[in-house]
Amino acid sequence: QGGTRSPRCDCAGDFHKKIGLFCCRGCPAGHYLKAPCTEPCGNSTCLVCPQDTFLAWENHHNSECARCQACDEQASQVALENCSAVADTRCGCKPGWFVECQVSQCVSSSPFYCQPCLDCGALHRHTRLLCSRRDTDCGTCLPGFYEHGDGCVSCPTSTLGSCPERCAAVCGWRQMF
């Protein structure tokens, strides 16, 4: 009191940092720094992030909050989790769609667009892996269908149709001449 020496940064508890003259307690997540503390080991003046902004971590220096991202509708993105004061919007793809990364080295923050998942049923194939982070992985042809070229062809319903070897093996028909 009344002295001139600045106090050392040896405040009780953690998360104090020198801001200007004094060691100040930082602002909690979801709050920005309005004014640093004005006395040794004091609390800074922190205000809650306004709507549509956030700060995910405790901090000593952010004088404004980050703007929440908007999901890219052009890329068919949807908000999986809405923005809060402590977390950004989490964008992703709606059910039945998967993330297609726009860069080769894909990380969580990489730009992406959403692609509709392959419908194995429409291709007359078993679903081997459900579509989520990548496209659906389709398996072998459904019963009543056989592999022909790249697709599954329906087994002939009568003995009149031709039934190649693979067809015969799957459909149980002998080749008829």
Partner: antibody, heavy 116, light 107 residues
Framework: EVQLVESGGGSVQPGGSLRLSCAAS????????MNWIRQAPGKGLEWITY????????YYADSVKGRFTISRDNAKNSLYLQMNSLRAEDTAVYYC?????????WGQGTLVTVSS | DIVMTQSPSSLSASVGDRVTITCQAS??????LSWYQQKPGKAPKLLIS???NLETGVPSRFSGSGSGTDFTFTISSLQPEDIATYYC?????????FGQGTRLEIK
């Protein structure tokens, strides 16, 4: 808009007293530390005293310690400097300034002349 | 007390010149240093804080650098309105202290 307006300057004889005021507006006065800085005619800047936002912590330069007292009234958004036992070398323009490190905002200053 | 030694004490330069002012602290002050501009009859104006952080609204021709004990203030291209006295100030420790100032004139 942040504004700081000093008043109370004038001429006084050595050994006399004077009380300076600084009226603050445009910001939450009670959130900020405040300072008095002076500048003798044709000379540089000299920080003389600081007060915390609550008024609970005060600091002084050796040149004024024991003679000057800084105080504040947050209800009135006002900062004060009580100057006693004035000397010729206290002649200066006195500025109030906001901040606890960098002085972000300054008043226009008020001149104090100590002369017999 | 921390002594701030500013140099030069005065300098004369032409419009468009690059101007550099230095400030030396008598002990390590990390980056707790500000630069102010003061025009005659006016209050000082904060230009730079934390050694290199340009204040909002301050033209980008002003810049600051340094850490520890040695600091530099630069005007990349001097303008007529930059004629003023410039001060460095440390706020690492109380008492807060200023450099003695650098008076900048146009040639």
């Amino acid at each position: 808009e942040v504004q700081l307006v000093e008043s109370g300057g004038g001429s006084v004889q050595p050994g006399g007293s004077l009380r300076l005021s600084c009226a603050a507006s445009g910001f939450t006065f009670s959130s900020y530390g405040m300072n008095w800085i002076r500048q003798a005619p044709g000379k540089g800047l000299e920080w003389i005293t600081y007060i915390s936002s609550s008024g609970g912590h005060t600091y002084y330069a050796d040149s004024v310690k024991g003679r000057f007292t800084i105080s504040r009234d947050n209800a009135k958004n006002s900062l004060y400097l009580q100057m006693n036992s004035l000397r010729a070398e206290d002649t200066a323009v006195y500025y109030c300034a906001r901040g606890q490190g960098p002085f972000e905002y300054w008043g226009q200053g008020t001149l104090v002349t100590v002369s017999s | 007390d921390i002594v701030m030694t500013q140099s030069p004490s005065s300098l004369s330069a032409s419009v468009g010149d690059r101007v550099t002012i230095t400030c030396q602290a008598s002990q390590d002050i990390s980056n707790y240093l500000s630069w102010y501009q003061q025009k005659p009859g006016k209050a000082p104006k904060l230009l730079i804080s934390d050694a290199s952080n340009l204040e909002t609204g301050v033209p980008s021709r002003f810049s600051g650098s340094g850490s520890g004990t040695d600091f530099t203030f630069t005007i990349s291209s001097l303008q007529p309105e930059d004629i003023a006295t410039y001060y460095c100030q440390q706020y690492d420790n109380l008492p807060i202290t200023f450099g003695q100032g650098t008076r900048l004139e146009i040639k």
